[in-house]
Structures are given as structure tokens and as C-alpha cells.
């Protein structure tokens, strides 16, 4: 997380640390599912049990976490590895239900009405243990509040060199400051971009940390997130069938 | 031209059956003689027991020696047994401590703050069929679902 601050206990109780080939993140759904980015766990798709999933952690290097293990990995069938980031979404089924408490709580899925809390300039919050402006993985869970960026503006930002190959699709949303300095970064992948539903006073997942500029927090570039509301039927279908 | 002897006999009646408490007898007759039978039916919420063994039905037949072919059963109150545990929740006995018999009431509840009850209000009654049943007729216990989207950022620390 670039330009963020330290999270306090209970701030992001849905935050999941995923260790496999690299450091990634996810968000707890219900008490036995983790929502994450397809690119973050693609290498482990046939070896779910190799994923080391940690919940209730605030510090990346603390032994005080709740250990969970993957029973199965579900990568969106429309995701193609190393060919852009469209449909960059995945679900992990945990082998056991976790006990919910103030440090481990699931994130809500967006209601149909949630788009009214995710308009341009509405503030979302990204969190993770990814690279900070110091160029190192964060020891403490960090978070940053960032506004949603107009889709056309974001698409245009990634049409300029050297990003001319970067395709911002309708399945993505962008967030960040035009001036830069606040962003998610490598190691934050799979984590939730969350929004407060003002009617229910509950947080919901609007985006999944997916991709962005080569230099995190770069001015004129934005973080790109998987647009979760587009995938509610897919998520519900998998969770109800498995 | 010989003798003709006409025999007449009066059947030895069996002892008059007394229905067990919470049961009734059918058919009701003035007396029961050889080959007559009766059945015992228990009131709703009670079940037929012969000793400790449950019976689906009971019928006794009067034998030629004036005895019934089997002893009178009892009608014992239906016991639904201890209710299923509720993961992330608890069960409270409303009727009385550990009372699990017919018409007893229990109340399921979920752990406050972090879980909420799905399906029904959590109130179950021990019915005549021996099952704990909710007001909506469900026999399976409720489910405690995690509450989503809670954060110390909006609750000011928990």
C-alpha cells in the first residue's frame, strides 16, 4: 500500500494473508470462503493444499494468526493467465469454517443498490501487506483511502505508452489520485477494495486488487480493481454448489 | 334309538382391561371372551411402550383359558431427546432445565454481534412425533450465519 497508514486491530477483520509462491491477499466471505484475484493464486490452482492462508493477522511476521487451509480453488473460467487481467477473480474454499470474532469477520458482498456507493469520487479503502513507498513489503497491515476514478479517464491513462497494451475492461474499476501517491501495490493483489454501505453501515467489497502502473502511486495512473458487482452470480453459484 | 346330548357352554371372560394412563381402549365392550380383542391407543404426545421397548401398535386377544395373550402396555410421554447443538450459538431450555418431553419449548440463539440466525426465530417445540419443530414446521436446527462487514473503523473499536 502506497501512501497509507497502519491498520488497527479490528479495522479490516476480513483481511486474509495468502502465502504460496508469493505474498498475496484475499477477503473472507461467510466463514469458509476467501475471495481473491485469479492471478494471485493461478500457480496453485491444481495444488490448493499448498496455499498457506492466515486470518486475524495484523502483522505479516507475527505468529499470532489463525491458520486456514484451502480445500479447493475456483478460478473464473474467463480469466487467461498472462493475457491481461479480465475476469481476475477467484474463490478459495477453506477446509474448515473459521470462528468469527472481532479480528476475523467476513466482508459483505455488494447489494444490488451498492453501485450508488461506488460512483466516481466515492471513497474506497484498500488494505494489504504489499510494497510501500519504501520499496519493501509492509510488516504491519496498511490501508489507504482512495477515490473511484471515472472509467473513461482510467481507460485513457492506460492507452498511453508504455501501457498501450493494458486493457481496462468493463469488468474493472479504477481508484486513486490523479496526483498519485496513494495506491495499492505488488503484494496487495487479491485484497479487497471496500466501501461503506451508508444504509446498513456495513462494509462491502467493491473491488479486488488486480493490476496497475509499473510504479505504484504514479501520477496520472490508477490502481485497477476487479469489479465485484459484475460477478455476484458467479460467486453465488460457486458458493451454493460447493 | 340312542341318546342325544346337547352341550352348552359359557365362555370364560378375560379380566376387564383397564387402559393405561394417557391411553384409551378400543373397542369398548361389556365383556371380552374367547377371541375378542382390544387395541390401546395413546393420546397425542404419548407413545406405546412394552417395558422399555416402543411399539408401533398394540392389540391383545382373549385366550380360551380366560387370560390375555400379552400384558398391558404403557403410554409414555414422547421425549424428543437433547436438541442438536448449534454451531456458533447456544440452546436454552424454556420449559425447565433439561426438559425435552412433549410440548417442551427450547430457544436457540446465536452468539451476539458476530452471528445472526437464519431460517427462523429459533423457538422449537417438542412435537408428538418426537421431533423438535419450529413454528414454520422445520425439524432441522437453525443456522448461525456470520454477520458481514463489521469493522472497528465504523463501530469505533469493538
Amino acid at each position: 500500500i502506497y501512501g497509507g497508514q497502519k491498520a488497527k486491530p479490528g479495522d479490516f477483520p476480513w483481511q486474509v494473508l495468502i502465502l504460496g509462491g508469493s505474498t498475496a491477499a484475499g477477503a473472507l466471505l461467510y466463514d469458509n470462503w476467501v475471495l481473491t484475484a485469479a492471478h494471485a493464486i493461478y500457480e496453485q490452482k491444481h495444488d490448493a493444499s499448498s496455499l498457506d492462508i492466515r486470518l486475524g493477522a495484523l502483522k505479516r511476521l507475527s505468529p499470532h494468526y489463525t491458520q486456514a487451509w484451502a480445500e479447493a480453488v475456483f478460478i473464473h473460467e474467463g480469466y487467461t493467465h498472462d493475457a491481461g487481467f479480465d475476469n481476475d477473480i477467484a474463490l478459495i474454499k477453506l477446509n474448515n469454517k473459521v470462528v468469527i470474532n472481532s479480528n476475523i469477520t467476513p466482508i459483505c458482498l455488494p447489494r444490488k443498490e451498492a453501485e450508488s456507493f461506488m460512483r466516481t469520487d466515492d471513497i474506497g479503502t484498500a488494505s494489504g501487506w504489499g510494497l510501500t513507498q519504501r520499496g519493501l513489503l509492509a510488516r504491519n497491515l496498511m490501508y489507504v483511502d482512495i477515490p473511484i476514478v471515472d472509467h473513461q479517464k482510467c481507460t485513457a491513462a492506460y492507452e498511453k505508452p508504455p501501457y498501450s497494451g493494458g486493457s481496462v475492461t468493463a469488468n474493472m474499476l479504477c481508484a486513486g489520485l490523479e496526483s498519485g501517491g496513494k495506491d495499492s501495490c505488488r503484494g496487495d493483489s487479491g485484497g479487497a477494495l471496500v466501501f461503506l454501505d451508508n444504509e446498513t453501515q456495513r462494509w462491502f467489497v467493491g473491488g479486488i486488487v488486480s493490476w496497475g502502473s509499473m510504479n505504484c502511486g504514479e501520477a496520472g495512473q490508477y490502481g485497477v480493481y476487479t469489479k465485484v458487482i459484475n460477478y455476484i452470480p458467479w460467486i453465488k453459484n460457486i458458493i451454493s454448489n460447493f | 334309538t340312542g341318546w342325544k346330548i346337547h352341550y352348552t357352554s359359557t365362555a370364560q371372560p378375560c379380566p376387564y382391561p383397564m387402559a393405561p394412563p394417557n391411553g384409551h381402549l378400543s373397542p369398548v365392550q361389556a365383556k371380552y371372551i374367547l377371541k375378542d380383542s382390544f387395541s390401546i391407543f395413546c393420546e397425542p404426545g404419548y407413545e406405546l411402550l412394552q417395558g422399555h421397548l416402543p411399539l408401533k401398535s398394540f392389540a391383545a386377544v382373549c385366550q380360551k383359558d380366560g387370560s390375555w395373550d400379552q400384558p398391558m402396555p404403557s403410554c409414555s410421554i414422547v421425549d424428543c431427546g437433547p436438541p442438536d447443538d448449534l454451531p456458533s450459538g447456544r440452546v436454552e431450555y424454556i420449559t425447565g432445565p433439561e426438559v425435552t418431553t412433549y410440548k417442551a419449548v427450547i430457544q436457540y440463539s446465536c452468539e451476539e454481534t458476530f452471528y445472526t440466525m437464519k431460517v427462523n426465530d429459533g423457538k422449537y417445540v417438542c412435537e408428538a412425533d418426537g421431533f423438535w419443530t419450529s413454528s414454520k414446521g422445520e425439524r432441522s436446527p437453525p443456522v448461525c450465519e456470520p454477520v458481514c462487514g463489521l469493522s472497528a473503523r465504523t463501530t469505533g473499536g469493538r
Epitope: 511476521l61 507475527s62 505468529p63 | -
Partner: antibody
Amino acid sequence: QVQLVQSGAEVKKPGASVKVSCKASGYTFTNHHMHWLRQAPGQGLEWIGDIDASDSETHYIEKFKDRATLTIDKSSSTAYMELSSLRSEDTAVYYCARGDITTTLRYFDVWGQGTLVTVSS
Amino acid sequence: DIQLTQSPSSLSASVGDRVTITCSASSSVRYMYWYQQKPGKAPKLLIYDTSNLASGVPSRFSGSGSGTDNTLTISSLQPEDFATYYCQQWSSYPLTFGQGTKVEIK
């Protein structure tokens, strides 16, 4: 090389307190958690708790919550374990041990030599 | 708390013998750790994450297992291996140790 050197043996009276030190060298002290364990004579190992050397956050097992206090001094790369209201059953060898930071973070890759604490009237 | 039960509690063996120590957990654990302790000395890490050899530990030591049953094997016992061995888990809080297995010279 990586080393943890503990303070010497102590004899204490019941009701007293004892403070054991553990000086670390050969690694970045603040990168690791420091754990404290004990071993009563002829017995197995028992975990007391740990301290994060980067920010002094502590965790104790229930049994020691009220009597054990773990602290650190970053400037001297030293960890301390104080145990109060001593009783005879606290007689044991007390160990500091460094927490791993490579995999699960849940084991001890370097141990101090141990400090014998005897509680006797 | 997860209870760890080591068996045997003690064993007598000769140099060159293959020795197996088991550690049975009261509920499933993901990873097991093994330590060696000699009299008057601190424990020393042998095996981490069930089967990985700690730095500087001879290859005659190996760990295996899953779920509730884990094993430490010494393929060919050496004179310096006579010691007490402990298993440890932290799959569930709090971390716990086995009661130890003492390996003595026959």
C-alpha cells in the same frame, strides 16, 4: 554467529520476583519475536509467551497473564522476562528462544542457554 | 489445547540402529516441529514444518506425517544422538510440546 546469552542462576524466596535477561547478537533484533519457555526439573517444555521486538507487543498464555512481564531494550538488543509472586512450583530452567521468520513463524530456531531459577524458603 | 503424546517415552538403542519416535496429536495439526535436548543444555531445532531439516542438522534425521500422527526418524543412530527429543505444534493456540522421548544407549 546468532547467539542468545542469558543471565545467571537465581535463588528466590516464595512471593518474590525474578527478572531474567537475554542478550541477542548476530542478527537484527527487531526482526524477530522473542519467546520465553520454561522447563521444571525432569519435566517437559512449557511456553510462557512472546514479545515482538519491533514494537514490544506481548502475548502470554492464560496461566502466566497476571504474573509474567516481557520487555525489551532495543538499544542493547536485550529481552527480559520478569515473573512475580514466585512459588516453589516456579522452580525451573527459563529459556529465551528466537521465533522463526521464514515460514510459519511458529517455531524456535535459536535458544538461550537457560537460566535456573530456584524458589525456596 | 492440543495434547501431544510421544511414544515411546524412552528407548534403548545401539549405534547404527534405526530409531523411530512418534508424536500423536489430540486433533489434527498441519505442521510439526522437532527438537533435540541434551542434559544441561537448551533444546536445538531439528525439523521444521513437519519434514524440513533445520540448518546444520545431519541428514540422518527426517520428519514425516500428517494430521494427528507424526514421526521423527534417525536412520543410523550416532553416539551424539543420545538425548531427549520433543515434538511441538502451533496449529492451534497455544503452542504445546510432547512430553519427550529419551533415547539411551543399550
